[in-house]
Interface confidence: low
């Protein structure tokens, strides 16, 4: 059928809770494309009816919730004007007995569920919640060894748990929990995170590679809306933070009042050897003050910038 096959790594998932997977594969999905999801090489596409427990939501496949029988290989077919790519995703579902230590822990966890804190430093854990915009996520609660985390050293900031002055006692089994609302129904999302402590300073030894941007300028008309992706490849065990800054300040903080320029939600695609992360910056309306400023994408120790410039006048 002329489609190029791309195989993603296995995803190991907890039964009885929501799960979503976004069929994005930059740069394939950046243009005008159609995305269709299938299960186990079926010719019948996954339903697009939002009441269905499993359905396609734009480029996402959404399970509300995931169940035992959902294990299998799912394919999303990305068709462009002159191209076709078929991405294979192997989903394995298991039953997690959260606080029953007699049953044992999680199986081979995917890497976002293994995180590292650096001894003596201020560090953070990230709750990876990847869902389409039809899903509304409530505030996140954090647990350690099945007890809700409280204390002065811990601060919940959006999807992160900030830990100040990390100690050896901070290693262990964590979980983040959020209530997800979709079409008036509520579901609990729980991610288990195995946390280890390292004395190694810095960024876990990995230097992320920023694929885009490349320290360049972008021509953009005054008043237009602009979205720019920052694409980063990094090792699977990385603990690097990825964000957009301007004047050495997070864009969400810098434009806190107007909210005219915002950082998007980070997404990632897992490959066998590395992860590809995408976090965008959205200019709701480009203003004169934006021109000439370097907007910096940071990924650990790596940085890259874009500079907006007015298009050259057309004298024709």
């Amino acid at each position: 059928d002329g489609c190029k096959d791309i195989f993603m790594k296995n995803e190991i998932l907890s039964a009885s809770q929501p799960f979503a997977f976004n069929c994005t594969f930059p740069p394939i999905t950046s243009g005008e494309v159609s995305v269709t999801w299938y299960k186990n090489s079926s010719k019948i596409p996954v339903s697009k009816i939002i009441q269905s427990r499993i359905h396609q939501d734009e480029t996402w496949i959404l399970f509300l919730p995931m169940e035992w029988g959902d294990s299998g290989v799912y394919q999303c077919v990305i068709k462009g004007r002159d191209s076709c790519h078929r991405i294979h995703v192997n989903l394995t579902v298991f039953e997690k007995h959260w606080c029953d230590t007699s049953i044992g822990g999680l199986p081979n966890l995917s890497d976002e569920y293994k995180q590292i804190l650096h001894l003596g430093k201020d560090d953070s854990l990230t709750c990876h919640l990847h869902f389409p915009k039809s899903c509304v996520l409530g505030p996140i609660k954090w647990y350690k060894d099945c007890n809700e985390i409280k204390g002065e050293r811990f601060t919940v900031l959006e999807t992160r748990l900030l830990v100040s002055n990390v100690s050896a006692e901070d290693r262990g089994n964590y979980a983040c929990q959020a209530i997800l609302t979709h079409s008036g129904k509520q579901y609990e999302v729980l991610n288990g995170i195995t946390v280890s402590i390292t004395e190694r300073a810095g960024y876990g030894g990995s230097v992320p590679k920023i694929i885009y941007p490349k320290n360049h300028s972008i021509e953009v008309q005054l008043g237009t809306t602009l979205i720019v992706d920052c694409n980063v490849t990094d090792t699977k065990d990385n603990t690097n933070l990825r964000c957009w800054r301007v004047n050495n300040t997070l864009v969400d903080d810098y434009y806190d009042e107007s909210k005219r320029i915002r950082e998007g939600v980070e997404t990632h695609v897992s490959f066998r050897e590395h992860n590809l992360y995408t976090v965008n910056i959205t200019f709701l309306e480009v203003k004169m003050e934006d021109y000439g400023l370097p907007f910096m994408c940071h990924a650990g120790v790596s940085t890259a910038y874009i500079i907006l410039q007015l298009p050259a006048p057309d004298f024709r």
Partner: nanobody, 128 residues
Framework: EVQLVESGGGLVQPGGSLRLSCAAS????????LGWYRQAPGKQREAVAT????????YYSDSVKGRFTISQDNAKTTVYLQMNSLRAEDTAVYYC?????????????????????SGQGTLVTVSS
Amino acid sequence: EVQLVESGGGLVQPGGSLRLSCAASGYSYRTQCLGWYRQAPGKQREAVATISGGGTSTYYSDSVKGRFTISQDNAKTTVYLQMNSLRAEDTAVYYCAAGLSVLGSWCHGGSSYEYTYSGQGTLVTVSS
């Protein structure tokens, strides 16, 4: 809007049985720890029995172990509490609770009450 509606309470003689039901609407239960707690006049509330959303694990307080059984229907939208060999000290208002994280200590016999939703309660009176 999430609603939990209890039923089945009433007056029963010591040694008798009752079956409480809790029907949920507007809520997808499957991932939650569901259960019952009770509060007698002038006493602290007590977790009586809980069941994980998948039905794979249950918890009973020592005071009801062997006498009470918690279960769910197949659709996991109704939770039952079968109460046998009732005693006078079982007299209390029984509340259905849901929306609690399965990580919350209440689900495993702890003393914190982190459930998100709770019903209006149904009175159980054990008296001769």
